[in-house]
């Protein structure tokens, strides 16, 4: 009953003489375990005897014995995990036919048939290509062989035009109940050059020998492959020649459909054949030519052909690196004269006159001078002739004003306060002078260009310079004005002593002045309007307080005289001329107030007083006034005072105070 049995295997197994077969097989039986397994070769059912007959290749019994098996046949099955796999090694051509798997369980019987196809020679693998091969697009080539057996080592090897392809092919094998195969997969990026080439998949044995092979011719779709040819085969032609370019399509798959020509990347109109003819070429036809050919895969562009049309130099023009050029700068002259081939010789002209020793396209004047100004032109020459000389280019050489000088217009001598006129002159200039500059800068009048009027000239306007200016300023040498003026900066200066003046010191005063023009001067000293001396110094051998006062000195020259500020001479001395005065007289009644005042002459003033009696006893009073209140008869006697400043001390003569009794005292007596 077929419903009780489920057996899985590949159905047909392929092999060749001397190889082996490996038959993957699994089974399931519904009612219990497999008890007997017999492998028949081409079994036939005998109706009479109700049993299968044929060559028994293998037989297993309950206890697992193999009573009469061939050694080359192995049952690799296992009743426990329902495996019925078997192998035949080696396998022979006469093993072809049906393998009958007779399976018997306790209650059921089944005959499963497996086809075995053993060829005399190894059969070829099959190459499987993708439907479309396109250049540079990676594809996978598959080589499939319906064979695999654990006991027989094989290899699949790829070749291109008979040479092994050493890209890494991935080989896989399958020995499952679904399928038995060996497969090699090769990743391959076909190039256009592979089109029409033969790819072979070889089946190799363990020693690498070819057992069989499959071949395919590659149909690689690719854009047209082009080369370009020029007739005559020179790409350098002369103006007026004719040139033919041919676009050769070396390969195209599929066939090309359109042709176009390009010059410098721009399509040429109405040029759509493989041949391009240029009649009587002109200079403008110089350029890079290529053809573009398209097929269904896409467009392809040939290599570029650089067509050079030769012609004599064209009328020249001169390019000057800078004009106007500044004197002293570097100027480059370039002769521009389109020509092919490039000119080999140049002739230069300055104001129509040939410049000797200059034969290059470019020349340089490192330091340009005014005389280099003018018109420059050139002629270019190549193998085809001498070009026309162009109109030339003007070189303007600019420079600062030259030989700038300054002139004093008014008569000399110049006195402080005069009006002075100066003019600024120059010899030449390019461009013209447009303004002047003066130094020092002052609020001075410029009545006309290049003339300066200085009104009320200052004593210190010693030198003036002018510049004549265009784009640059050129300065004249400064002119000394030699302004005459009365002495200036007159002042009294104490020379000695260095510190403060004390009575009795030797004192010197100096009459200083800062400047005078002319230099010859006279000095005068005065005190309180009285003339003291005519030297630059005023000397005191021993100064006295009476010499103190306000001093001035005068300095004069031929232009005028100048006085110093009044200078105060201060003499310091110790207290002198001390005396004691009594406001109420020398005689005072007892009980009244007696006031004694210490008067003195001192510089600086007295800062401390002391009082003494007739016994030279110091009294406890330190002020300028000594008040005795109430005065007593005992106070009668002589008194004196002492004054102190920082210079020294002085004391008064004695003064006598007489205190008499009051009437009351006399009455009491």
């Amino acid at each position: 009953d077929s419903s009780k049995w489920n057996i899985e295997h590949p159905g047909t197994i392929y092999a060749w003489e001397g190889a082996c077969v490996w038959v993957p097989c699994t089974y399931r039986v519904l009612d219990g375990a497999l008890e007997t397994f017999i492998l028949f070769h081409n079994p036939e059912y005998n109706q009479n005897m109700s049993k299968f007959e044929g060559t028994r290749l293998y037989e297993s019994t309950k206890d697992g014995k193999v009573p009469s098996g061939q050694k080359r046949v192995q049952f690799l099955g296992n009743k426990i995990n329902n495996n019925c796999t078997l192998s035949i090694h080696p396998v022979h051509v006469n093993d072809s036919g049906q393998l009958g798997l007779r399976m018997v369980s306790k209650t059921e019987k089944w005959m499963e048939r497996i086809h075995l196809n053993v060829s005399e020679r190894p059969f070829p693998p099959r190459i499987q290509l993708p439907p479309k091969l396109q250049e540079s697009q990676e594809v996978t080539l598959t080589c499939l062989l319906n064979f695999s057996c654990y006991g027989y080592q094989i290899q699949l090897q790829w070749l291109l035009e008979g040479v092994p392809m050493r890209q890494a092919a991935v080989t896989s094998t399958s020995l499952s109940t679904k399928s038995v195969f060996t497969r090699s997969e090769l990743k391959f990026s076909p190039q256009w050059s592979h089109h029409g080439k033969i790819v072979t998949c070889e089946l190799h044995d363990v020693d690498g020998k070819v057992l069989s092979e499959d071949m395919v011719q590659l149909n690689v779709k690719h854009t047209p492959k082009l080369t370009i040819e020029v007739t005559p085969n020179e790409t350098i032609v002369r103006k007026g020649d004719s040139v033919t370019m041919t676009c050769k399509v070396n390969s195209s798959n599929p066939e090309y459909t359109t042709v176009s020509w390009l010059k410098d990347g721009i399509p040429l109109k109405e040029q759509n054949t493989l041949m391009l003819t240029l009649h009587e070429v002109t200079k403008s036809q110089t350029g890079r030519y290529c053809c573009r050919v398209s097929n269904d895969v896409g467009p392809a562009t040939s290599e570029k052909v650089f067509l050079q049309v030769q012609y004599a130099p064209e009328p020249s023009r001169v390019q000057i690196s800078q004009s106007p050029a500044v004197e002293g700068s570097e100027v480059n002259f370039l002769c521009i004269s389109p020509a092919n081939p490039l000119p080999t010789n140049y002739t230069w002209y300055h104001n129509g006159k040939e410049v000797q020793g200059r034969t290059e396209k470019q020349f340089q004047i490192q330091k340009i001078l005014p005389w280099h100004a003018g018109t420059y032109s050139c002629e270019a020459e190549n193998i085809l002739g001498i070009g026309e000389r162009g109109p030339g280019t003007e070189l303007d050489v600019q420079y600062p004003p030259k030989k700038v000088t300054m002139v004093i217009e008014n008569p000399t001598p110049i006195r402080e306060g005069d009006t002075v006129t100066l003019s600024c002159n120059y010899s030449s200039s390019n461009p013209i002078v447009n303004h002047y500059e003066w130094r020092p800068r002052g609020a001075w009048e410029e009545p006309s260009l290049g003339v300066l009027k200085i009104q009320n000239i200052g004593w210190n306007n010693t030198a003036v310079a002018c510049a004549a200016c265009n784009n640059w300023c050129s300065w004249a040498s400064p002119v000394t004005l030699n302004v005459l003026y009365a002495p200036r900066g007159v002042r009294v200066r104490k020379i000695k002593p260095l510190s403060e003046i004390h009575s009795g010191n030797s004192v010197s005063l100096q009459c200083d002045f800062s400047s005078s023009h002319p230099k010859e001067v006279q000095f005068f000293w005065e005190k309180n309007g009285s003339l003291l001396g005519k030297e630059s110094q005023l000397n005191f051998d021993s100064i006295s307080p009476e010499d103190a006062g306000s001093y001035s000195c005068w300095v004069n020259n031929s232009i005028g005289q100048t006085a110093s500020k009044a200078w105060t001479l201060e003499v310091l001395y110790a207290p002198r001329r001390l005396r004691v005065s009594m406001s109420q007289g020398n005689q005072v009644m007892e009980g009244k107030t007696a006031t004694l005042t210490c008067e003195s002459d001192a510089n600086p003033p007295v800062y401390s007083y002391a009082w003494f009696d007739w016994n030279n006893q110091s009294l406890p009073y330190s002020g300028r006034m000594l008040r005795l209140e109430p005065v007593k008869v005992q106070h009668s006697g002589a008194y004196w005072c002492q004054g102190t400043n920082r210079v020294g001390k002085g004391h008064s003569p004695l003064i006598t105070l007489t205190v008499y009794y009051s009437p009351q005292t006399i009455g009491r007596r």
């Epitope: 050493r166 363990v206 020693d207 690498g208 020998k209 070819v210 057992l211």
Partner: antibody, heavy 119, light 112 residues
Framework: QVQLQQPGAELVKPGASVKLSCKTS????????MQWVKQRPGRGLEWIGR????????HYNENFTTKVTLTVDETSNTAYMHLSGLTSEDSAVYYC????????????WGQGTSVTVSS | DVVLTQTPLSLPVSLGDQASISCRSS???????????LHWYLQKPGQSPKLLIY???NRFSGVPDRFSGSGSGTDFTLKISRVEAEDLGAYFC?????????FGGGTKLEIK
């Protein structure tokens, strides 16, 4: 042109090892299997084994499996044969030879290296 | 392993003579792919073997046409139509049908 260069001679002590080289030029090294052959006077030629330089796959004559190790260095296009546990029986001339991939014939041979095992 | 028996062991010849060397195999050298991998080499003294004939009858590049090979299955022959001085040396047959490859014992071609 195809060339296989081998050193002229090696002198080694018994029990030691030696590594013979075979430097190739003039062809694509990885396409052709390299074979090694031993020749002793009066004993003819013996095939030792082969190596596929592309895969490094080797196959040895059973008589040499414990004696020989074949290797290649693709970067220098050089094949090597390592002989170990040398005895006087290993004294011989050893040739490397390229095997053609179409007819499985040894078409180009090296000049051979003479190995002498002596104490 | 396949045994190749070469006869004669030594072959004395005169220059200009024909020479013939036989090589017999212990089993068929026809590979399953149909090709027979029997080859002939010449080894001159102090040199390495040089290929003469491959797969029974194909002459290797540069080999003069006085050398020819024949045979099938297990019996093979190398013939030299007119021996020249440069042909002297030891000739070996070799098979690469079965692994391991094997060589005949050699035949020494020498002047009489």
């Amino acid at each position: 042109q195809v060339q296989l260069q081998q050193p002229g001679a090696e002198l080694v002590k018994p029990g030691a090892s030696v590594k013979l080289s075979c430097k190739t030029s003039g062809y694509t090294f990885t396409i052709y299997w390299m074979q090694w052959v031993k020749q002793r006077p009066g004993r003819g030629l013996e095939w030792i084994g082969r190596i596929d330089p592309h895969s490094g796959d080797t196959h040895y004559n059973e008589n040499f499996t414990t004696k020989v190790t074949l290797t290649v260095d693709e970067t220098s296009n050089t094949a090597y044969m390592h002989l170990s546990g040398l005895t006087s029986e290993d004294s011989a001339v050893y040739y490397c030879a390229r095997r053609d991939y179409s007819y499985y014939v040894l078409d180009y041979w090296g000049q051979g290296t003479s190995v002498t095992v002596s104490s | 392993d396949v045994v190749l028996t070469q006869t004669p062991l030594s072959l004395p010849v005169s220059l200009g003579d024909q020479a013939s060397i036989s090589c017999r195999s212990s089993q068929s050298l026809v590979h399953i792919n149909g090709d027979t991998y029997l080859h002939w080499y010449l080894q001159k003294p102090g040199q390495s073997p040089k290929l003469l004939i491959y797969t029974v009858f194909n002459r290797f590049s540069g080999v003069p046409d006085r050398f020819s090979g024949s045979g099938s299955g297990t019996d093979f022959t190398l013939k030299i139509s007119r021996v020249e001085a440069e042909d002297l040396g030891a000739y070996f047959c070799s098979q690469s049908t079965h692994v391991p490859y094997t060589f005949g014992g050699g035949t020494k071609l020498e002047i009489k």
